[in-house]
Interface confidence: low
């Protein structure tokens, strides 16, 4: 639980934080676990301890191993372990999985890639960024503080991103690189011209005079969140609210459902105590979004009473 994996490349700076936290006033002792040898605190050493931080300036493959940190307070001691692995630099471009930090996901609206572990280092801007070993160029890429922003993210932007910066320690500069994968998710989905599932175009709905009747206008608009989509009913080309017949009401609120991943809306028209004159009206189901408007027309007809004569 109180063990942490850390890794780095030879001849680069690596700074590791003790997995056990304590107040700044607490002393922290570091040991090389295999030999139980104390890590010095003098900064003239290539590997030295500085409070909660263990610094390899620069790191060597031989530094690999488990390091013990003990946080000492007047009333307790807490022990943590840092499992450090230093790798040789790769001659080719590929960054092996064991050198990768956690994958981050981005979308059209949010495309920040944070440089991993950078907060442990004494660095100054600018940060350099590479994708699949190629330096990033162009106005779409903006190095901002400790992260990269990509404008107008596309699926092709997925890949391995490496940040490179300089750590300064007492006037000496050390290079640091860190790589993580970036995946692109389609957050907005898509929208399409409205598709009315019900009612069918020019449908005739049978109703009984004196009874209640419901008509449902149901349409689908695309996949994912639809910012602008509506279904509504009109009577003889007039909005229900303007038509002025209190017996005929639209159900308040539209139900958003997802049919096969599609975003769909329903609007129910309720007709109370159906009258003869209702059969003369034209009922229009309208579905509207960014692409335009689709209309399906329904008419009512009297349901013939069942003949009970033998």
């Amino acid at each position: 639980k109180f063990s942490k994996q850390s890794w780095g490349l030879e001849n680069e700076a690596l700074i590791v934080r003790c997995p056990r936290q304590g107040k700044p006033s607490y002393t922290v002792d570091w040991y090389y676990s295999q030999t139980n040898k104390s890590i010095p605190t003098q900064e003239r050493n290539r590997v030295f301890a500085s409070g909660q931080l263990l610094k390899f300036l620069p790191a060597a493959v031989a530094d690999s191993g488990i390091y013990t940190c003990i946080v000492r307070s007047p009333t307790f001691n807490r022990t943590g372990y840092a499992n450090v692995t230093i790798y040789k630099k790769q001659s080719d471009c590929n960054v092996p999985d064991y050198l990768m930090y956690s994958t981050v996901s981005g979308s059209e609206k949010n495309s920040k890639i944070y440089c991993p572990t950078i907060d442990l280092y004494n660095w100054t801007a600018p940060l350099e960024w590479f994708k699949n070993c190629q330096a990033l160029q162009g106005s779409r890429y903006r190095a901002h503080k400790s992260f990269l922003v990509i404008d107008n993210v596309m699926t092709e932007d997925a890949g391995d991103y490496t940040c490179k910066f300089i750590h300064n320690e007492n006037g000496a500069n050390y290079s640091v690189t860190a790589t993580r994968s970036f995946t692109v998710k389609d957050e907005q989905g898509f929208s399409l011209f409205p598709v009315i599932g019900a009612p069918a175009q020019n449908e005739i709905k049978e109703v009984e005079i004196g009874k209640n009747a419901n008509l449902t206008c149901s349409a689908c608009f695309g996949k994912g969140t639809q910012f602008l989509a509506a279904v509504l009913w009109q009577l003889n080309g007039t909005k229900i609210t303007d038509f002025g017949e209190p017996r005929i009401q639209q159900e308040e609120g539209q139900n958003q459902s997802f049919s096969n991943g599609l975003a769909c809306l329903d609007m129910v028209l309720r007709i109370a105590d159906v009258k003869e004159e209702d059969l003369l009206l034209q009922y229009d189901c309208l579905a509207l979004n960014l692409h335009g408007l689709r209309r399906h027309t329904v008419r009512l007809s009297r349901k013939n009473p069942i003949d009970h004569h033998s």
Epitope: T225, L228, A229
Partner: nanobody, 117 residues
Framework: EVQLVESGGGLVQPGGSLRLSCAAS????????MGWFRQAPGKEREFVAV????????YYADSVKGRFTISADNSKNTAYLQMNSLKPEDTAVYYC??????????WGQGTLVTVSS
Amino acid sequence: EVQLVESGGGLVQPGGSLRLSCAASGFTLGDYVMGWFRQAPGKEREFVAVIYTSDGSTYYADSVKGRFTISADNSKNTAYLQMNSLKPEDTAVYYCVVSFSTRGPYWGQGTLVTVSS
């Protein structure tokens, strides 16, 4: 309750310009879109332009692309439609609309634009 007030409509000659404004009130800020539809006499309501206030991205109907520009002032909850090189076929009632990811759309009362010599 969300309220939209459109202004800026009027009579203009072909080739002229107009700027429509739509002031929205009655909601707290979040991700939303503001846009314009229009309805010419005897025709269906049609999409004109929309702006996503979260990132400023804009979308236009092909018939107005290059002539109309939509913009928004988030601090005032106001959308604008700058209409240049107006044609007689742009004559219509222009409706402002605002819509949220979870509710809406809400429509304005409309402002009449007439393009005629």
